[in-house]
Amino acid sequence: KPEAQPFAHLTINAASIPSGSHKVTLSSWYHDRGWAKISNMTLSNGKLRVNQDGFYYLYANICFRHHETSGSVPTDYLQLMVYVVKTSIKIPSSHNLMKGGSTKNWSGNSEFHFYSINVGGFFKLRAGEEISIQVSNPSLLDPDQDATYFGAFKVQDID
Amino acid sequence: KPEAQPFAHLTINAASIPSGSHKVTLSSWYHDRGWAKISNMTLSNGKLRVNQDGFYYLYANICFRHHETSGSVPTDYLQLMVYVVKTSIKIPSSHNLMKGGSTKNWSGNSEFHFYSINVGGFFKLRAGEEISIQVSNPSLLDPDQDATYFGAFKVQDID
Amino acid sequence: KPEAQPFAHLTINAASIPSGSHKVTLSSWYHDRGWAKISNMTLSNGKLRVNQDGFYYLYANICFRHHETSGSVPTDYLQLMVYVVKTSIKIPSSHNLMKGGSTKNWSGNSEFHFYSINVGGFFKLRAGEEISIQVSNPSLLDPDQDATYFGAFKVQDID
């Protein structure tokens, strides 16, 4: 039977969501509870390490939300953004693979605000490279496992 | 070793983004620089030609952005849309496979506006069929390779 | 030749879209017309039944739209949401796998409004489990087959 292909589906660790409105690399994800799972890949300090060269489909879903009971939003005009970043350890460098998001005005009369971003794409990844997620306004992240997650699965070998 | 399955990840050619607010088929994509790549598929005049029958996962990520230093937006109420289109050459016809987007009011007090769309789906494609991307308001496209791209990878054969 | 892997791409049945602004499980999808197709999975009462254990990539694209000629929207502040739900029949239980959406103010001066949501993720599914789609404000759904759909394809076996 062929060796199982690498994959991961990682969900946000609600207990470790940073506060603030700055852009930040999310550093804590679950890999083994609820829908979260990982195989033939490694999770280290919030980064998803590739152990096997290949072409992978990468995806991320990031939800932001705010209820007026939490106080006011940091600014009337929010940039709610996600960046899927590839880091090469051998040659220390980081590059954005995918980005998505929207500017939002959450100063209105509504008591609840919500917005989700989804990105996905097909990338060549080498063993040792790492995938991480950066977001703006992390304090607005929705901590549910169905809301804020990212993942990867290997589709095929590199010739 | 089995033949490598077809795939493509195509990023927008920033130098060839059309101006205007009309709906247009984007005609120039990179296939061999940065994250862009192609294998066992063909790119011709902005259309992704299928060379091998199969079931493919298709995706697109389209980002729009505007900074007040670029002047005013073309309209207060924008329709920011993407359409993933399949064209059959044998019988000249075009059909929308997927669409996404949002109406936006970018006339507000913010000096920067941003919005991204992501669509994806699983489709049966035949050799000779072509996939292209139509957008509204092309002059607002984000030209970064992590922002505006589309792609496909073959998942399995047609029985 | 290996058995074809399970897949489905299901498009909304325009004739059966419920009215109202409440959250509802969409109960009628096409599986055999236009882009819709299914293989080694089963569609029953709007739920996509898994017949074969495996890791699947699941996705959904949901479009909402409103034209002023249809009358006013149910409320100024809309929650336009989608939930991809897994139901286990053996142990009757339902869990959200993915969610996405946005709060929207569609009370403005524009005569047309549109918004799309896309979600996707990689999940372990067991034979007998079912996937369904819940949305808020179903009366605002775009009934086109390129607009409102969901699907799944098996990526690999469970070891």
């Epitope: - | 060839s16 059309p18 101006s19 205007g20 607010s21 009309h22 709906k23 247009v24 088929t25 984007l26 005609s27 120039s28 005049n45 902005g46 259309k47 073309p74 309209t75 207060d76 109420y77 329709q79 849309m81 064209t87 000249p92 075009s94 292209s132 509204s136 092309p138 | 524009s110 005569e111 047309f112």
Partner: antibody
Amino acid sequence: QSVKESGGGLVTPGGTLTLTCTASGFSLSNNAMSWVRQAPGKGLEWIGYIYPGGSPYYANWAKGRFTISRTSTTVDLKMTSLTTEDTATYFCARHVSDGGWYLYIWGPGTLVTVSL
Amino acid sequence: DMIQTPASVEVAVGGTVTINCQASQSIGSNLAWYQQKPGQPPKLLIYGASTLASGVPSRFKGSGSGTQFTFTISDVECTAAATYYCQQAYSISNVDNAFGGGTEVVVK
């Protein structure tokens, strides 16, 4: 569905004229509209377009002297500093409904003559 | 801008006529063809380089992409006598004219 231009006629060089486009059978306010002109015995010349709620775009040669604007029921073309070279039939045309820059419904045209 | 050739062409009833349109830079498949008869406004025949507009007979055919486009009328009838124009529908930047110069088709 149809459109109709009005406001054409005789104007002296250096003058100003505003043409008006009205529609029946559809709403002008949610359709893109172009203006095109045709000098006697010559080809078609695109002037510019305007999208719903939006700012207009113009051909290079039309920038500055030509202004496209819209109300809820009309799309107007204002022409200033007219010369004899501007003598032409002026057409307004509705774009295809999906927003492409393809001109689907044309009016019969209105003749503008610039002469002393 | 769009270069259209020939400026005029004669064709016999039942014959075939071909008109070419060249864009100065790639416009993908963003091209339309129009028919105009004397005293009438133009009529959209083809858009997206090859898609027939509603109600247009299949003897009208468009092809090409990038910078080279072709318009063909086969099995020509007397009613095909008209002037035909191509129009790029890609970008409005630096446009002097979106239309080609036109081709007069004379049916013998």
